[in-house]
């Protein structure tokens, strides 16, 4: 998490014009995880590497966007590039490239995440939702999701909307939300941890 957009950008920018064209065509037919839509063909084919990077991140978020990019690169026979991309973005899949901060480990952890355990209390008691959104924006929340949460009229409905996106999150994404909660309402987290 955190640098997937950078890793995707480097991978796509290091494709030749012909390879980028091939990448886009493969992206139109690559199998997608359930619940994810496809980038419209018309928009996709006209994009440069930078636009495509941002579109991948906004459509699929950073973690899945990087995984999908690596899958397509592998399918194109670019195993080394796919491997480098995954090394830079996937938790526990080897060291990050020299000089790059390795992402936090996200091995399977026993039981429910704090965020899921205390869902009802967080919906009822979080007041600083805007702060959370800013902390999560571009990392685990797409622009659309960010706007959708902000559009809700009350804090509980904002939190309810935010929780509607968490089923697609991995443990690391939930850790980011927990970290943001610790920074904005530490007393609430401490209270819930004691309960």
């Amino acid at each position: 998490m955190g640098r997937a957009r950078d890793a995707i950008l480097d991978a796509l920018e290091n494709l030749t014009a012909e390879e980028l064209k091939k990448f886009k065509l493969k992206l139109l037919s690559v199998p997608l995880r359930e619940g994810y839509g496809r980038i419209p063909r018309g928009a996709l084919l006209s994009m440069d590497a930078l636009d495509l990077t941002d579109k991948l991140v906004s459509f699929y978020l950073e973690t899945y966007g990087a995984e999908l990019t690596a899958n397509v690169l592998r399918d194109m026979g670019l195993q080394e590039m796919a491997g480098q991309l995954q090394a830079a973005t996937h938790q526990g899949s080897g060291a990050a490239p020299a000089g790059i901060q390795a992402p936090p480990q996200s091995a399977a952890k026993p039981g429910l995440h704090f965020i899921d355990q205390h869902r009802a209390a967080l919906i009822a008691r979080v007041t600083n939702v805007e702060w959370l959104l800013d902390a999560l924006y571009g990392k685990v929340l797409t622009d659309e999701q960010y706007q959708a949460v902000r559009a809700e009229p009350t804090n509980p409905s904002k939190m309810r909307k935010l929780f509607s996106f968490t089923p697609a999150w991995n443990w690391t994404c939930k850790d980011l939300l927990l970290q943001a909660l610790r920074e904005s309402q530490s007393y609430l987290v401490e209270d819930l941890e004691r309960s």
Epitope: G2, R5, N14, M81, Q84, G99, I100
Partner: antibody, heavy 117, light 107 residues
Framework: QVQLQQSGAELARPGASVKLSCKAS????????ISWVKQRTGQGLEWIGQ????????YYNEKFKDKATLTADKSSSTVYMELRSLTSEDSAVYFC??????????WGQGTTLTVSS | DIQMNQSPSSLSASLGDTITINCHAS??????LSWYQQKPGNIPKVLIY???NLQTGVPTRFSGSGSGTGFTLTISRLQPEDIATYYC?????????FGGGTKLEIK
């Protein structure tokens, strides 16, 4: 460890051209972009352009489009920047920097260019 | 091109203080903003990437926040080694562009 070794200081005449080099080591050369950044004495940082090493894709700041040309030699893991039609305005320190996506994590030591008649 | 406006251009503070430097982008850059520190006579060094992520090895006294068009670098418990010029840089669109810099001095 990651290193970007830049060529030594240059003294050039107005109207001439110079070619600065930046040799990379300690990382997979073709996985990144290398940028060049200009800094005049006592001034801020100005991004000149960037070259992606595997594809040779280049991007330039419009201001430097007619001034600078970026090239890469994969066999020697070296990036070059040629500056042409030199004037006193081109006297500056030029840095090469490895970009990981949209931010740079390693910089060369800088090359001082002095343009003087 | 995206313009990056940094303020203040210079700043004088006492050891132990907390200071903030602001950076405003001329258009939405999401969270694609980095902060650099350049000490006198030295090369620039990245402190923060993606608006709020601390680069490996950078002290936790440094923190970044913001998204969209407004960003802030905060340095808490100011130390003598923090004397430097600080630059923001956007990474949303080519050409990458830097702010004009903020020169930090100790009172």
């Amino acid at each position: 460890q990651v290193q970007l070794q830049q060529s030594g200081a240059e003294l050039a005449r107005p109207g001439a051209s110079v070619k600065l080099s930046c040799k990379a080591s300690g990382f997979s050369f073709t996985s990144y972009g290398i940028s060049w950044v200009k800094q005049r004495t006592g001034q801020g940082l100005e991004w000149i352009g960037q070259i992606y090493l595997r594809s040779s894709n280049t991007y330039y700041n419009e201001k430097f489009k007619d001034k600078a040309t970026l090239t890469a030699d994969k066999s020697s893991s070296t990036v070059y920047m040629e500056l042409r039609s030199l004037t006193s305005e081109d006297s500056a320190v030029y840095f090469c920097a490895r970009y990981y996506g949209s931010s740079s994590d390693y910089w060369g030591q800088g090359t001082t260019l002095t343009v003087s008649s | 091109d995206i313009q990056m406006n940094q303020s203040p251009s210079s700043l004088s503070a006492s050891l132990g203080d907390t200071i903030t430097i602001n950076c405003h982008a001329s258009q939405n850059i999401n969270v694609w903003l980095s902060w650099y520190q350049q000490k006198p006579g030295n090369i620039p060094k990245v402190l923060i990437y993606q608006a709020s992520n601390l680069q490996t090895g950078v002290p936790t006294r440094f923190s970044g926040s913001g998204s969209g068009t407004g960003f802030t670098l905060t340095i808490s418990r100011l130390q003598p080694e923090d004397i430097a010029t600080y630059y923001c840089q956007q990474g949303q669109r080519y050409p990458w562009t830097f702010g004009g810099g903020t020169k930090l001095e100790i009172k």
